[in-house]
């Protein structure tokens, strides 16, 4: 027996029925992506990390979910202290605010 058609990756088992006239086949099938691959074509990669390159987990669709305090597509840009001057302050650690030379204060303003 053979089946042709699209079977989308899923954790659920699908029941396929086939009647050849000679015999009746009923079988269950599922397609799962390799670890860290998501999407209909299993071509979306997401592996959680907590290092120089990013700070994130992955949701069930393979989207990066940033740890609190981090932002950007790779979750590797720290979210500075609320009120930190975007012009004269920056941070490498969430909640921090480091001033450019010549600027000072809690918010570098």
């Amino acid at each position: 027996a053979s089946h042709s058609g699209m079977i989308n990756p899923s954790r659920q088992w699908q029941t396929l029925k086939q009647n050849t006239g000679v015999a009746h086949f009923e079988y269950q099938i599922r397609v799962t992506c390799d670890d860290y691959y998501y999407g209909f074509g299993c071509n979306k990669f997401c592996r959680p990390r907590d290092d120089f390159f990013g700070h994130y987990a992955c949701d069930q669709n393979g989207n990066k979910t940033c740890m609190e305090g981090w932002m950007g597509p790779e979750c590797n840009r720290a979210i500075c202290r609320q009120g930190c001057s975007p012009k004269h302050g920056s941070c490498k650690l969430p909640g921090d605010c480091r001033c450019q030379y010549g600027w000072q204060g809690l918010y570098c303003d």
Partner: antibody
């Protein structure tokens, strides 16, 4: 105030099992993650493994892979380190540390002694 | 895995001395290096992150420098409370790895 409290350490025989807990407070557990780091008596620091805040992913040092399992109960804001097939070389103080900002926040540690 | 090699493994110094500890990574880790201080029976404390950034609440006598493979922790004027063990750590990739530690003792 961020707080991490480990518990569950003790004396166990080689080949035995032990489960450590890391109770977190002062932050939203599911938005971060937890690392486990250990320190053998008189020795340096060794990373053991970590788990994401949603509990969906964990990774381990080669030295414990297949023997240790990290899990999380987000409803209890607690991470667990299940240690099986323990060896004498697993004797150490075990610390948990919050993910997401270097290791800025640590627990006080819990001592695990593997001896017959 | 990335190896972090610290030197010296121990040193003796007096209060007021300038102390320098070095750490070498087995491969380029950019600036993804932190320094920790640990006292007996206590958890490590973060001193420096991203190679040169002083962590909140840490005295300004502590400073860090370096990038790539060579990093330095400097204590400009050693205080009695600074006698402890210091560790470097890379957070460039998983697994994070630590140096073997440098014990700073009283001369």
């Amino acid at each position: 105030e961020v707080q991490l409290v480990e518990s569950g350490g003790g004396l166990v025989q080689p080949g035995g099992s032990l489960r450590l807990s890391c109770a977190a407070s002062g932050f939203t557990f599911s938005n971060y993650g937890i690392h486990w780091v250990r320190q053998a008596p008189g020795k340096g620091l060794e990373w053991v493994g970590w788990i994401t805040g949603n509990g969906g992913y964990s990774d381990y040092a080669d030295s414990v892979k297949g023997r240790f399992t990290i899990s999380a109960d987000t409803s209890k804001n607690t991470a667990y380190l299940q240690m099986n097939s323990l060896r004498a070389e697993d004797t150490a103080v075990y610390y948990c540390a919050r993910a997401g900002s270097w290791f800025a926040y640590w627990g006080q540690g819990t001592l695990v002694t593997v001896s017959s | 895995d990335i190896q972090m090699t610290q030197s010296p493994s121990s040193l003796s110094a007096s209060v007021g001395d300038r102390v320098t500890i070095t750490c070498r990574a087995s491969q380029d880790v950019s600036t993804a290096v932190a320094w920790y201080q640990q006292k007996p029976g206590k958890a490590p404390k973060l001193l420096i992150y991203s190679a040169s950034f002083l962590y909140s609440g840490v005295p300004s006598r502590f400073s860090g420098s370096g990038s790539g493979t060579d990093f330095t922790l400097t204590i400009s004027s050693l205080q009695p409370e600074d006698f402890a063990t210091y560790y470097c750590q890379q957070s460039y990739t998983t697994p994070p790895t630590f140096g073997q530690g440098t014990k700073v003792e009283i001369k």
